[in-house]
């Protein structure tokens, strides 16, 4: 029977007693940064080329003996994984394997730099079709390995990291923080965060999505023939990259931002138990576990967005923190949080000629997080109009005045310490859905684009008193593109995009002695685009 | 996934005023930094990735190395230039003494440098 | 192009070893071990065992194990297979072929075991 | 006694389509992706027609398909040839050898 894991990756219609979708990633090279491996292993011959790099530290011990199984068990295992016959996800795809790793699975910075340079110049001497690095392996934060990762990227290959095994942040590790890498955390059969004796998988804002990391069955170095069950990150991120290698060879020209925003999307989301997250990472871990499209094809009229989160801002008075889309992504929305609730909102602003989203601290807060929302927007041409503090009326307004422009996302940033003082604002007059409403003594900004066939609209959910989170979701076939709160109020610790769910968190109103007139609102801007709908069905 | 996490240790060394028998001065103002593992067992003292700015050449990486190799021997110091970068990122990979980690920041061209250290197998 | 070549038709007695080679060119060899395969005259294929240019080790049949025995020698991309004790049932065409995919045979070697 | 069971001979005329079956058991061609099927002239070596169950190397013709159910493998031969006269076999992956089948004498009437 199919083993588990590839069952949990399989969308329904794919699903006989056997797994075996189509095209297995035949138009797709996959580099394996690794151990060296056994490549003709039965699962695995004749679809791995084991390329002459080797640049690895000698073993430690005086008494190491050097058994040549357990050189090869790690990376044979994760070819297997991506590529093999009867266990791997990309049954199509060839693979290159460049040994980084010694026979105790350790390796260098540096040797796995220079393996990326090896891979960066074969692909100039010999362009191929798309590109797919592994690095199953992870260090310490590291500057030089994630800048080397960002240049790769930028080169047009995808690279795919595990996030770790360490039960711990992955943005303290290499190359899992490199904001370009496709970082994956381990979930098992039951869709839990993986266990790895005292530890387990790495979490937080750097981890892109989850993919099944334990017992995952395939090939043994300890035989021709043999299977093993192995458990890790790097078993989730060998996942990733063979689904990443099916999609590229249905599709050979996505960008790598496209190739992510796809791999989000088809996701099983909310799946995950988040109880076994350190309770402040539960809202920066992404709860997706990836999953193949459910047809190779087609998925080019969907509106993708993501939901990106800054690094913490820190406590101090004037903090602030930035979260940054891609760089063929759109800013189209811009929110905060704080878990004190002491914040100054936030701001888009143009930083080196793209947008950026900025979060403000507060005196006494603990500190910000800039919650960005990215998006695929071919065509678009968006900027930001803002408003000054209305001081004296009801409420600041801003809206999209330029012809053919559609608000995409709202953000209020204030300089007063503490709205919660003043006066709350108006709520927004019906009818005016190309415009942003917030407190007088706040600046409003509205991000506002102009795209082919873009249309978007304002849905609100709003209860009377505070509950801890209010939320309001978009239909099928539209996308949240922005996320706010209405009130800015003090008791509200900010909104944030989960998915396709707009989320304001406030502090529980037994807790903050607010009065039930203080309604708090959520509101998304849920937008489509006719024109990729439009496009898709000419190509179909 | 951001650059900008803090969390690992940063040494920023201020490029002092001394020419040290430089025959190109860095630019006025810049300062190149220094970096290494937070995780002190991770940590592989005596090899260094010496990254340079963006647009530096080839030759001109050489040069740097060479450079450094003969500041390093006039000083006393033996180094071993162990690999040129290019086609990702400009520089090289040494092994010296950490003593000379401060003549090193000091070169032209120099961004920053980063102690090596250990990748593990997930 | 990719070939494998092997050696010469042999006959042999009964009781006697018979060693016979197969040489690979044309692709990479550690990405594939060699497969050998025998066919007795009219009848089916025999899967006899394999062996791994990688590392030389290697997986035998469970009909022939303790009889036969398969070697490398990486220096002449060349394999071999010895099958001892040999009994009249063992005449055969005796093949390799590359990898457990089977993908390329080599001509055949026609061993004739008879008293 | 081979692993696989295959018919002993099946015929067609020209520009036909026949098929040969390969049954097993899920020890072999029913838990395996690794169904593979040859084709072997009088006094040559075989020749690999269909890969993996279904794939065809470059070179093979597309006349030439493989599928598989359960435990059952077929290949699937259309607008028959004079030369597509020979004997084909199956094999399969078991957990740790290979098998084949007794092989199949296909005629072109």
């Known amino acids: 029977s199919i083993p588990w894991n590839l069952e949990r990756i399989t969308p329904p219609r794919y699903r006989a007693d056997e797994y075996q979708p189509p095209d297995g990633g035949s138009l797709v090279e996959v580099y394996l940064l690794d151990t060296s491996i056994q490549s003709d292993h039965r699962e695995i011959e004749g679809r791995v080329m084991v390329t002459d790099f080797e640049n690895v530290p000698e073993e430690d011990g005086t008494r190491f003996h050097r058994q040549a199984s357990k050189c090869d068990s790690h990376g044979t295992h994760l070819a297997g994984v991506v590529s093999g016959r009867d266990a791997g996800v990309a049954k199509g795809a060839s693979m290159r394997s460049l040994r980084v790793l010694n026979c105790q699975g350790k390796g260098t910075v540096s040797g796995t730099l220079i393996g990326l340079e090896f891979i960066r110049k074969s692909q100039l001497v010999q362009p191929v079709g798309p590109l797919v690095v592994l690095l199953p392996l992870a260090g310490g934060y590291s500057r030089v390995l994630n800048a080397a990762c960002q240049r790769l990227a930028r080169a047009g290959v995808v690279l795919v990291t595990a996030a770790g095994n360490f039960r711990d942040d992955a943005c303290l590790y290499s190359p899992a923080s490199a904001p370009e890498v496709i970082t994956v955390g381990a979930t098992n059969a039951q869709d839990q965060p993986v266990t790895l004796g005292t530890l387990g998988t790495n979490f937080g804002r750097c981890v892109d999505l989850f993919a099944p990391g334990e017992d995952i069955i395939g090939a043994s170095s300890d035989c021709s023939t043999c299977f093993v069950s192995q458990s890790g990150t790097s078993q989730a991120a060998a996942h990733v990259a063979g689904i990443a290698a099916m999609m590229l060879s249905a599709e050979p020209e996505l960008t790598l931002a496209e190739l992510r925003q796809r791999l989000i999307h088809f996701s099983a989301k909310d799946v995950i138990n988040e109880a076994w997250f350190p309770e402040d990472q539960r809202v920066l871990t992404p709860n997706l576990v990836a999953a193949l499209p459910p047809s190779t094809h087609g998925a080019g009229w969907q509106l993708f967005c993501r939901t990106v989160w800054s690094a913490h801002s820190g406590p101090t008075r004037m903090a602030t923190a930035i979260a940054r889309c891609a760089p063929d992504e759109e800013l189209l929305s811009c929110s905060s949080f704080s878990r004190s609730g002491k914040r100054r909102g936030e701001r888009m602003e143009a930083q080196g000629g793209k947008l950026v989203c900025r979060a403000h601290n507060a005196f006494g807060g603990e500190g910000v997080y800039a919650i960005a929302r990215c998006c695929l927007l071919p065509q678009a041409n968006c900027s930001v109009h803002t408003a000054p503090p209305a001081e004296a009326s009801m409420g600041t307004r801003v809206h999209c005045h330029q012809q053919g422009h559609v608000l995409t996302g709202c953000s209020s940033h204030w300089e007063v310490e503490d709205l919660g003082t003043h006066k709350p604002p108006v709520l927004r007059p019906r009818g005016q859905p190309n415009q942003c409403v917030g407190h007088r003594e706040a600046s409003i900004h509205a991000s506002c684009c102009h795209a082919p066939g873009l249309e978007c609209k304002v849905k609100e959910h709003g209860i009377p008193a505070p509950q801890g989170q209010v939320t309001v979701a978009c239909e099928e076939g539209w996308t949240l593109t922005g996320c706010s709160a209405l009130p800015g109020t003090s008791h509200v610790l900010g909104a944030y995009a989960v998915d396709n769910t707009c989320v304001v968190r406030s502090r529980d109103v037994s807790t903050t002695g607010s009065t039930s007139e203080e309604a708090v609102t959520a509101v998304a801007i849920c937008c489509r685009s006719r024109h990729l709908a439009q496009a898709s069905q000419e190509l179909q | 996934q951001e650059d900008e996490d803090g969390d690992y240790e940063e040494l920023v060394l201020a490029l002092r005023s001394e020419e040290d028998g430089l025959a190109e001065a860095p630019e006025h103002g810049t300062t190149a930094t220094f970096h290494r593992c937070a995780k002190d067992p991770w940590r592989l003292p005596g090899t260094y990735v010496v990254v340079l700015k963006e647009e530096t050449h080839l030759s001109q990486s050489e040069r740097t190395a060479r450079r450094l190799q003969a500041q390093a021997a006039r000083r006393g110091y033996l180094t071993k230039i162990l690999h040129v970068f290019h086609g990702l990122l400009p520089g090289f990979l040494v092994k010296m003494s950490g003593d000379l980690l401060e003549l090193a920041l000091k070169l032209p061209h120099v961004d920053y440098i980063e102690e090596d250290s250990s990748v593990f197998a997930q | 192009q990719i070939q494998l070549v092997q050696s010469g038709a042999e006959v042999k007695k009964p009781g006697a070893s018979v060693k016979v080679s197969c040489k690979a060119s044309?692709?990479?060899?550690?990405?594939?071990?060699i497969s050998w395969v025998r066919q007795a005259p009219g009848q089916g294929l025999e899967w006899m065992g394999w062996i791994s240019f990688y590392n030389g080790n290697t997986n035998y049949a469970q009909k022939v194990q303790g009889r036969v025995t398969m070697t490398t020698d990486t220096s002449t991309s060349t394999v071999y297979m010895e099958l001892r004790s040999l009994r009249s049932d063992d005449t055969a065409v005796y093949f390799c072929?590359?990898?457990?995919?089977?993908?390329?045979w080599g001509q055949g070697t026609t061993v004739t075991v008879s008293s | 006694q081979s692993a696989l069971t295959q018919p002993a001979s099946v015929s067609g005329s020209p520009g036909q389509s026949i098929t040969i079956s390969c049954t097993g058991t899920?020890?072999?061609?029913?838990?395996?992706?690794?169904v593979s099927w040859y084709q072997q002239h009088p006094g040559k070596p075989p020749k690999l027609m269909i890969y993996e169950v279904s794939n065809r190397p470059s070179g093979v013709s597309n006349r030439f398909s493989g599928s598989k159910s359960g435990n059952t493998a077929s290949l699937t031969i259309s607008g028959l040839q004079a030369e597509d006269e020979a004997d084909y076999f199956c094999?399969?992956?078991?957990?740790?050898?290979?098998?084949f089948g007794g092989g199949t004498k296909l005629a072109v009437l």
């Open positions: 044309g692709y990479t060899l550690t990405s594939y071990g």
């Open positions: 072929a590359r990898g457990y995919g089977m993908d390329v």
């Open positions: 094999s399969s992956y078991t957990s740790t050898s290979m098998v």
């Open positions: 899920s020890s072999d061609v029913g838990g395996y992706n690794s």
